[in-house]
């Protein structure tokens, strides 16, 4: 069948019909429904929500909706033995204790099963010792502490402020520095925007608010006990000592009221510069230990959380494609939340729900997409992207052969300033073209396109007249699809003004105060930004599933490959003498990029000219486009990170949230001047250049004429 036979709505009308069916009021209603009680992964409440979503997706008209369950390692506080931190005096008496829970927001005082703030997967322990303040606990912060300030964290409890990097990286860095415990806190400098009131009177973090979150270093492994394979009924599970990515020292999060009590007594070295000072009225001394009068006092952690194998449930909905049912476009976002999930994830889940409803409406009118669309409500994202990863592990053979694209749908908003998109370069043109067709919801841009407001507010640093599109990193459910399987991926949400708001994420992230009211009162009362995000996410899915020729432009990959090659070369050229000594050359990489550019250009010309009515040739060309992302996968993975297999992009080794380009070369060059064996270190740089050059060349050849 041709694609026109797959529908009784004219092709031009298809997208408009789909977009017109999306309603802000429905998203609002769904968000309310999803946020009235907590939906923590592994709980009965979240299982019930999975069944509700399954039922509603069936009602909306999907062909099938199934639950996919897995038994994975999760982590919970001990209900009878709470976690807390103390200041103890020389006699061991607790003279100060941190709070055991967040004061509940108005209207939620009687809600049960609000999990108290904890760091998921922290081991149990009661370490006591002197405190060292380590700023954000980034790699560079520990370099400054150890190299410039000569502060040894070995045997110390470190206190780090949230922000800048993924919390798991903070814990890993602290472990490597020899710390015996980690306290994480939210500093007002990062989580309290000036001129805004704290919740419930505004969207800022109150002093008793605390950010929950997992502290794993999974590097894409999924369930810590079954890396590489699904955690199904017959799974072989590793012992806890062999589990992937678990922290080895106790970790606990606190709010800034409690942090003040710990930090105000700090002695030792002054902060190295003002970037180490937050907004509390404390000196931000680094330590170790407390100042003069309090020098005999210590800090003690009391952590009693347990790791438990627990059942989780994904909801997988299918809308079968009429022409190419064996080609999958996936829209997925998670359902589990730390507490109410007002923003994370339910502002995303509500958008997915409305997108499913709109697609279902079209299907009931007789329309089908050209390709199959899979919709997913993932479980246990907050515990390490577990639901999505286990499902992808279980279905990896299908996905690597049939996966066209994955669009992620976590939080729809983290602000209300402008659009934010991270995606594969293959999707740049799709995103540009789509946003040019959508109306901007922004004040002052009435009657203007989304592309125009987005470009004005978030301009590309390289290309004038174009918006910024960022690299994919990780920290969300696209990870397994993109970084492991090489399926073209993208994500979109509304964000804050990064120029004026320097706080990390949004202030109430992962706190009890992330409620429906937070969104409805302060972020998006008209749900117009949610609707825009629904249009972007849904529009991308629609085009990916329905375009006769896949809306991928391989020339955009050529452009970024050159940019990334230039960038990594300039990093290496900071060591000109060593490059000469060890004969380090980037010629092979630049040559491969040049070849890729030429072949991509020729492929694009053929794409314009070929006979689209010939289904075999059409399928062949589309397969070359689909498999291009796959061609950047190295089956051996990156060094020490076997599940990060994409050679062009990986999550930064220093911040899971950030994407790094040519990560193999980047990591080989990182801090190379401090390596004990320079010959070996530069040898690894050369090997990584070789791997990158080969991969780019091999990917280019997949775009060559097949015979």
């Amino acid at each position: 069948k041709s694609s026109n036979e797959a529908t009784n709505i004219t092709p031009k009308h298809n997208m408009k019909a789909f977009l017109d069916e999306l309603k802000a009021e429905n998203i609002k209603k769904f968000l309310y429904n999803f946020t009235q009680i907590p939906h923590l992964a592994g709980t009965e409440q979240n299982f019930q929500l999975a069944k509700q979503i399954q039922s509603q997706w069936k009602e909306f008209g999907l062909d099938s909706v199934e639950l996919a369950h897995y038994d994975v390692l999760l982590s919970y506080p001990n209900k009878t033995h709470p976690n807390y931190i103390s200041i103890i005096n020389e006699d061991g008496n607790e003279i100060f204790n941190t709070s055991l829970f967040e004061p509940p927001p108005p209207g939620y005082e009687n809600v049960s099963d609000i999990v108290p703030p904890f760091s998921a997967f922290s081991p149990q322990g009661m370490p006591e010792g002197d405190l060292v303040y380590v700023n954000y606990a980034r790699t560079e912060d520990f370099f400054k502490l150890e190299r410039d300030m000569k502060i040894n964290c070995s045997g110390k409890i470190v206190i780090a402020r949230y922000g800048k990097v993924f919390r798991g990286n903070k814990v890993k860095n602290a472990q490597l520095a020899g710390a015996k415990g980690v306290i994480l806190y939210s500093d007002p400098a990062d989580y309290f925007a000036p001129g805004v009131k704290s919740y419930p009177d505004g969207w800022n973090l109150p002093g008793g608010g605390v950010q929950r979150g997992n502290i794993l270093n999974l590097n894409g492994a999924g369930d810590p006990l079954t890396p590489g394979y699904p955690a199904n009924e017959y799974a072989y599970r590793r012992g806890i000592a062999e589990a992937v990515g678990l922290p080895s020292i106790p970790v606990h999060p606190i709010g800034y009221y409690d942090a003040q009590k710990l930090l105000e007594k700090m002695g030792g070295s002054a902060p190295p510069d003002s970037s180490w000072r937050g907004s509390l009225k404390v000196p931000y001394n680094v330590g170790p230990g407390f100042t003069g009068n309090f020098s005999t006092q210590k800090v003690k952690m009391h952590i009693h959380s347990t790791n438990e194998v627990t059942r989780i449930y994904n909801v997988i909905g299918t809308l079968r494609g009429a022409v190419e049912p064996d080609r999958y476009v996936i829209l997925g976002g998670h359902r589990d939340s730390w507490v109410f999930g007002g923003i994370d994830p339910q502002s995303g889940a509500a958008v997915v729900h409305e997108i499913v409803r709109s697609f279902g409406t079209l299907k009931k009118e007789g329309w089908r997409p050209r390709r199959t669309i899979l919709f997913a409500s993932w479980d246990a994202e907050e515990f390490g992207l577990l639901g999505s990863t286990e499902w992808a592990e279980e279905n990896s053979r299908l996905l690597q052969e049939r996966g066209v694209a994955y669009i992620n749908a976590d939080s729809s908003i983290e602000g209300n300033y402008t659009l934010r998109v991270d995606c594969t370069p293959l999707m740049y043109s799709l995103v540009h073209n789509l946003t040019k067709e959508l109306k901007s919801p922004d004040e002052g841009f009435e009657g203007k396109s989304l592309y125009e407001s987005w470009t004005k507010k978030s301009p590309s640093p390289e290309f004038s007249g174009m918006p910024r599109i960022s690299k994919l990193g990780s920290g969300n459910d696209f990870e397994v699809f993109f970084q492991r399987l090489g399926i073209a991926s993208g994500r979109a949400r509304y964000t804050k003004n990064w120029e004026t708001n320097k706080f990390s994420g949004y202030p109430l992230y992962h706190s009890v105060y992330e409620t429906y009211e937070l969104v409805e009162k302060f972020y998006d009362p008209m749900f117009k930004y949610h609707l825009t995000v629904a249009q972007v996410r849904g529009g991308m899915v629609f085009e990916l599933a329905n375009s006769i020729v896949l809306p991928f432009d391989c020339r955009d990959y050529a452009v970024v490959l050159r940019k990334y090659a230039d960038k990594i070369y300039s990093i290496s050229m900071k060591h000109p003498q060593e490059m000469k000594t060890y004969s380090v050359s980037f010629d092979s990489l630049f040559s491969a990029v040049k070849n890729f550019t030429e072949i991509a250009s020729k492929f694009s010309e053929r794409l314009q000219d070929f006979d689209k009515s010939n289904p075999i040739v059409l399928r062949m060309m589309n397969d070359q486009l689909m498999f291009l992302e796959r061609a950047f996968i190295d089956p051996l993975g990156l060094p020490d990170r076997p599940f990060y297999r994409h050679v062009i992009y990986a999550p930064s080794s220093h911040n899971k949230y950030a994407g790094e380009s040519f990560p193999g070369i980047y990591d080989a060059l990182f801090d190379i001047e401090s390596k004990v064996d320079p010959s070996k270190a530069w040898g690894e740089v050369k090997r990584q250049i070789y791997v990158a050059a080969f991969t780019v060349q091999a990917a280019a050849e997949t775009l060559s004429e097949v015979a």
Epitope: R147, D148, M149, A270, D273, S275, R277
Partner: antibody, heavy 121, light 111 residues
Framework: EVQLVQSGAEVKKPGESLKISCKGS????????IGWVRQMPGKGLEWMGI????????RYSPSFQGQVTISADKSISTAYLQWSSLKASDTAMYYC??????????????WGQGTLVTVSS | QSVLTQPPSVSGAPGQRVTISCTGS?????????VHWYQQLPGTAPKLLIY???NRPSGVPDRFSGSKSGTSASLAITGLQAEDEADYYC???????????FGTGTKVTVL
């Protein structure tokens, strides 16, 4: 009492080598950075470089990199500043100074009395 | 050549207030590094006067005070006394040089 005692004045000819010293006492010598500062006749202070005797980590001002060598012998709590080939323009008063703590970014709270180096043919 | 600029000289009558400015850049004072001040009496080694922008070591009279804003810092001497006649130097870490820099120095004269 915390103090830094520097070696005596030196008169040298151009091309000669020289090593001046700075002995610390009254504190844990290995736990504090020691910096060197030059003051040419009638001129201001110039930061030359710094050493952490605990691990011999040494940092130089770009202006002095390759011109002088800073070292320390922790067994005798002494820091050194040396030249392999003096020039007339090296004529100056040289001060050693201890940082206030183990941090490179701390101020210098204890200073030596200075060593006058005169280079003349 | 110093990257911290001070006025070559300031003067004041006994009892007066004088201030010395220290202007840096985005790689030193403006980067958030602390500013320290030293006093050098004629023929002696420098002495720490102010550390961490505004802190006085014990023994330094409270007539001396320091402040910092943006890419500049200043030292104020109130109730100027004859024994304050000396050279004064500011100091800050500079990230572009990976080391410390001193100011050009200011001679304070008590009239």
């Amino acid at each position: 009492e915390v103090q830094l005692v520097q070696s005596g004045a030196e008169v040298k000819k151009p091309g000669e080598s020289l090593k001046i010293s700075c002995k610390g006492s009254g504190y844990s010598f290995t736990s504090y950075w020691i910096g060197w500062v030059r003051q040419m006749p009638g001129k201001g202070l110039e930061w030359m470089g710094i050493i952490y005797p605990g691990d011999s980590d040494t940092r130089y001002s770009p202006s002095f990199q390759g011109q002088v060598t800073i070292s320390a012998d922790k067994s005798i709590s002494t820091a050194y500043l040396q030249w392999s080939s003096l020039k007339a323009s090296d004529t100056a008063m040289y001060y050693c100074a201890r940082s206030m703590g183990s941090s490179l970014y701390a101020s210098s709270d204890v200073w030596g009395q200075g060593t006058l180096v005169t280079v003349s043919s | 050549q110093s990257v911290l600029t001070q006025p070559p000289s300031v003067s004041g009558a006994p009892g007066q207030r004088v201030t010395i400015s220290c202007t840096g850049s985005s790689s030193n004072i403006g980067a958030g590094y602390d500013v320290h001040w030293y006093q050098q009496l004629p023929g002696t080694a420098p002495k720490l006067l102010i550390y961490g922008n505004s802190n006085r070591p014990s023994g330094v009279p409270d007539r001396f005070s320091g402040s910092k804003s943006g890419t500049s810092a200043s030292l104020a001497i109130t109730g100027l006394q004859a024994e304050d006649e000396a050279d004064y130097y500011c100091q800050s870490y500079d990230s572009s040089l990976s080391g410390y820099v001193f100011g050009t120095g200011t001679k304070v004269t008590v009239l």
